[in-house]
């Protein structure tokens, strides 16, 4: 058993059918010695008397808010949550496996640049009685500070007969050095509590591996005289690291017909312009990627040929 926060305790339960459970001793936070009784949640049934209460925690029915009283007055509370292990594996019931980029991916994180700011998000089908707490650091043995905000509900969507909820959090490395080579990964830890169930989820990454630039901005077409060709131009996104001479992007320019089946023409360039043939009813799209490190491509910025 360990303390999650004041008066909230997590019991680690290795569960299997007929498991003996965990013996837990609760102590009433009071100088009083006599006439103390214990109850669980809203029940008036007295579970025991005395300054300490010993319970055998076998299942969620044994978790909840234990209260010690004296003469009708509440002395203190202890909320017991369960962290369940089955077949040697801690439960991961609260969050949905996003399966990208691999199985057992519960947390996904992205950064728009090298400033040390990043966003993580996760999915759940649970809509109520749910709280998250996020901590982060650079490295784990001698951790350097990363400050995370509160997790917030960022999207809701329907998937089949299921409603899915997306939560996200923004974090900022306290003393980020954008140009430095990373040697220690960022660690992100999410505590999730649903009703009386506690779970924790972790992710470890280098900022360079989670970079995903914003799409190029100010995408424009300039027709070339007496030609079906156009000059496409764009700019680096505002959110990208500066100076651009050091933090350089490479670009992919794509001409896509109205039909998805039509052949796509693609051009790769390090410049912020390109000359392409603009077909009728086609659209031109441009996306960006770090020039020197193969992290994610940005989403596409698009304009119609017409």
């Amino acid at each position: 058993i360990w303390e999650l926060k004041k008066d909230v305790y997590v019991v680690e339960l290795d569960w299997y059918p007929d498991a003996p459970g965990e013996m837990v001793v609760l102590t009433c936070d009071t100088p009083e010695e006599d006439g103390i009784t214990w109850t669980l949640d809203q029940s008036s049934e007295v579970l025991g008397s005395g300054k300490t209460l010993t319970i055998q925690v076998k299942e969620f029915g044994d978790a909840g808010q234990y209260t010690c009283h004296k003469g009708g007055e509440v002395l203190s509370h202890s909320l017991l949550l369960l962290h369940k292990k089955e077949d040697g594996i801690w439960s991961t019931d609260i969050l949905k496996d996003q399966k990208e980029p691999k199985n057992k991916t519960f947390l996904r994180c992205e950064a728009k640049n090298y400033s040390g700011r990043f966003t993580c998000w996760w999915l759940t089908t649970i809509s109520t009685d749910l709280t998250f707490s996020v901590k982060s650091s650079r490295g784990s043995s001698d951790p350097q500070g990363v400050t995370c905000g509160a997790a917030t509900l960022s999207a809701e969507r329907v998937r089949g007969d299921n409603k899915e909820y997306e939560y996200s959090v923004e974090c900022q490395e306290d003393s980020a050095c954008p140009a430095a080579e990373e040697s220690l990964p960022i660690e992100v830890m999410v505590d999730a509590v649903h009703k009386l169930k506690y779970e924790n989820y972790t992710s470890s990454f280098f900022i360079r591996d989670i970079i995903k630039p914003d799409p190029p901005k100010n995408l424009q077409l300039k027709p070339l005289k007496n030609s079906r060709q156009v000059e496409v131009s764009w700019e680096y996104p505002d959110t990208w690291s500066t100076p651009h001479s050091y933090f350089s992007l490479t670009f992919c320019v794509q001409v896509q017909g109205k039909s998805k089946r039509e052949k796509k023409d693609r051009v790769f360039t390090d410049k912020t312009s390109a000359t392409v043939i603009c077909r009728k009813n086609a659209s031109i799209s441009v996306r960006a990627q770090d020039r020197y490190y193969s992290s994610s491509w940005s989403e596409w910025a698009s304009v119609p040929c017409s």
Partner: nanobody
């Protein structure tokens, strides 16, 4: 929201078997841990057993161990209670319930309940 409808109850002789079904509709059935409870006249609702969302673990009250088996078919949104060697003291209304916490024998840990199906065991 999940709606639950029990079926399969009836009158049987002591020593016989009965299979109860609970059909779920509404939000995704496979998200929920499922439990069976029963209530005899004049008594509190009593836990019978539960099964986790994947159907890989079950949990039974002492009174059900060795005689009752819970299973589920997530493709058909149904949970089953197979009861054998029935005794007159098994006579009760049997309820199926859906919740988020497994294992739990506590009725308030279940959020959705069916209307129940009557099982009568005569001697």
């Amino acid at each position: 929201e999940v709606q639950l409808v029990e079926s399969g109850g009836g009158v049987v002789q002591a020593g016989e078997s009965l299979r109860l079904s609970c059909a779920a509709s509404g939000r995704s059935f496979s998200n929920y841990e499922m439990g069976w409870f029963r209530q005899a006249p004049g008594t509190e609702r009593e836990f019978v057993g539960a099964i986790n969302r994947r159907g890989s673990s079950t949990y039974y009250a002492d009174s059900a161990k060795g005689r009752f088996t819970i299973s589920r078919d997530n493709a058909k949104n149904t949970v089953f209670l197979q009861m054998s060697s029935l005794k007159p003291e098994d006579t009760a209304v049997y309820y199926c319930a859906a919740g988020w916490l497994f294992p739990s024998s506590r009725s308030r840990d279940y959020d959705y309940w069916g209307q129940g199906t009557q099982v009568t065991v005569s001697s």
